[in-house]
């Protein structure tokens, strides 16, 4: 059978080979399509309810004034010329409809690096056969389920026209330090060959890089936090972030009732000052961030270092805040 591709709504003429150019003609067309259950026979003498769909022209050709989805199928003509020689024509008709240009809807203007983001939804309306949607990043195809790319697809069919609407939702996880203005586009590829893809207008969301929170450093003087009774310990909380955050102090996991300050001085250390100290930096944008904890201990005369597992008292002694 000869393959014929016809656009929905357009006319189609199928030639009946070997048919005399004008009546009288001995020919018959047989159709097996979505409009028939088995074979429907149409003859030149016909003319009737089928004329709106298919009718035999004076030259023996079959004329379809406006091809529809239900006209997909097999068309056969059997003709006899004036000398009684029989010729058969056989056609396999497929129909198609090119949709309108696809569009990206609900598109994001900003993406966050390192986390999954919805880029947008690509919509194509009015295709037949359904066809496919695919996404591109900077002109290169994006492969779902690779490198933080995921795609959710949906296909719907119009109850009356039989045409398809396709939807494809793109989620990506942009890499940190990647392109700050990636270009995304979506394209529709028809279900029938020999028709080029249709591409959306591109979108260029900004990629926002959340500033990684640098660690809050707690520096203790003397190093190691072991001091002789009556000595002084200085704790300094170093935070690289700008603007400078508020610094509060904790002892043994309990906030110390002191005004915010990056430096905590413990003069004239006594047993009550022993314990585990840390600082908490509170940023307006990021919330609180705690430093590592350091242990402050008293070295009795003759000891080489901090007492293992020493536990400080609950008193604050005399504190000085720089």
């Amino acid at each position: 059978a000869q393959n014929i591709t016809a656009r929905i709504g357009e006319p189609l003429v199928l030639k009946c080979k070997g048919a005399p150019k004008k009546p009288p003609q001995r020919l018959e067309w047989k159709l097996n399509t979505g409009r028939t259950e088995a074979w429907k026979v149409l003859s030149p003498q016909g003319g009737g309810p089928w004329d709106s769909v298919a009718r035999v022209l004076p030259n023996g050709s079959l004329f379809l004034p406006a091809v529809g989805i239900q006209d997909e199928g097999i068309f056969r003509c059997q003709a006899m010329n004036r000398n009684g020689k029989e010729t058969k024509s056989n056609y396999r008709v497929r129909v198609y409809q090119i949709p309108g240009k696809p569009e990206i809807v609900d598109s994001a203007s900003e993406l966050t690096a390192g986390v999954p983001n919805k880029v947008g939804t690509c919509v194509s309306e009015g295709s037949y056969p359904a066809g496919t949607l695919s996404w591109h990043l900077d002109g290169k195809p994006l492969v779902p389920n690779e490198k933080g790319v995921s795609v959710k697809e949906q296909t719907r069919r119009h109850p009356e026209t039989g045409l398809f609407t396709l939807q494809s939702e793109l989620m990506v996880t942009p890499a940190r330090g990647g392109d700050p203005r990636p270009t995304f586009s979506c394209s529709f590829s028809p279900g029938l060959p020999r028709h080029r893809a249709l591409r959306t207008a591109p979108i260029q969301p900004r990629v926002w890089e959340p500033v990684p929170l640098e660690e809050v450093q707690l520096v203790v003087e003397p190093e190691g936090g072991a001091v002789a009774p009556g000595g002084t310990v200085t704790l300094t909380c170093e935070v690289p972030a700008q603007p400078s955050p508020q610094i509060h102090w904790m002892k043994d996991g309990v906030p110390l009732p002191l005004p915010p300050s990056p430096v905590l001085i413990l003069p004239e250390i006594g047993p009550q000052d022993q314990g585990t100290y840390s600082c908490v930096a509170t940023h307006s944008s990021h919330g609180p961030q705690e430093s590592r904890a350091v242990s402050i201990s008293i070295i009795e005369p003759g000891e080489e270092g901090p007492t293992a597992g020493s536990v400080g008292g609950s008193g604050l002694g005399t504190l000085a805040l720089a």
């Epitope: 088995a38 003319g47 309810p49 089928w50 709106s52 769909v53």
Partner: antibody, heavy 119, light 107 residues
Framework: EVQLVESGGGLVQPGRSLKLSCVVS????????MTWIRQTPGKGLEWVAS????????YYPDSVKDRFTISRDNAKSTLYLQMNSLRSEDTATYYC????????????WGQGVMVTVSS | DIQMTQSPSSMSVSLGDTITITCRAS??????VNWFQQKPGKSPRRMIY???NLADGVPSRFSGSRSGSIYSLTISSLESEDVADYHC?????????FGSGTKVEIK
């Protein structure tokens, strides 16, 4: 709302002529074939004439061929049936209907108009 | 020409009954058969199109079926409002042909 309203019926003598009209609304007239169907008490429903959406092609049964002419004015969304050489057996209620091809099988009907052929 | 032989010509039934009306086509008309309901003094109303499809607004107790050249209209659990004449029509070939009609009455 789809509406088909027939007019032009009445009492006419055998051999005379009558023209029926059908004004439609509620759908795109020139997208559809249109058909006249009649009903006689004795014979039930009978197809009278069909016309394609452009008006280029018309179809009739042998019983009215060469006597009746179906036509349409797409600009006025109006269907016509010109009936000549009327006979007593043409006495019937005439209905205007939407459809007539295989895609639309008479989904809407007018209220009908009575034609009586009698001397 | 195609003949559509409709039977029965009339039937007297009880409310709640299930009834079937048939039309036999004298030659192949495929799926191109419609069924119409006509109440006294009213225009016909399409009930079933293309042999088996229920027209808009028609109660689901109506159904159409086909077995070869025999087309059937079934009304399950008949209601008083279903009292009417019923007609089949083939619209596959000219001349378009109606069945002779079936009158459905209540006993």
């Amino acid at each position: 709302e789809v509406q088909l309203v027939e007019s032009g019926g009445g009492l006419v003598q055998p051999g005379r002529s009558l023209k029926l009209s059908c004004v439609v609304s509620g759908f795109t007239f020139n997208n559809y074939w249109m058909t006249w169907i009649r009903q006689t008490p004795g014979k039930g429903l009978e197809w009278v004439a069909s016309i394609d959406n452009s008006g280029d092609n018309t179809y009739y049964p042998d019983s009215v061929k060469d006597r009746f002419t179906i036509s349409r004015d797409n600009a006025k969304s109006t269907l016509y049936l010109q009936m000549n050489s009327l006979r007593s057996e043409d006495t019937a209620t005439y209905y205007c209907t939407r459809g007539g091809d295989i895609t639309t099988g008479f989904d809407y009907w007018g209220q009908g108009v009575m034609v009586t052929v009698s001397s | 020409d195609i003949q559509m032989t409709q039977s029965p010509s009339s039937m007297s039934v009880s409310l709640g009954d299930t009834i079937t009306i048939t039309c036999r086509a004298s030659q192949d008309v495929g799926i191109y058969v419609n069924w119409f309901q006509q109440k006294p003094g009213k225009s016909p109303r399409r009930m079933i199109y293309r042999a088996t499809n229920l027209a808009d607004g028609v109660p689901s107790r109506f159904s159409g079926s086909r077995s070869g050249s025999i087309y059937s209209l079934t009304i399950s659990s008949l209601e008083s409002e279903d009292v009417a004449d019923y007609h089949c029509l083939e619209f596959d070939e000219h001349p378009l042909t109606f069945g002779s009609g079936t009158k459905v009455e209540i006993k």
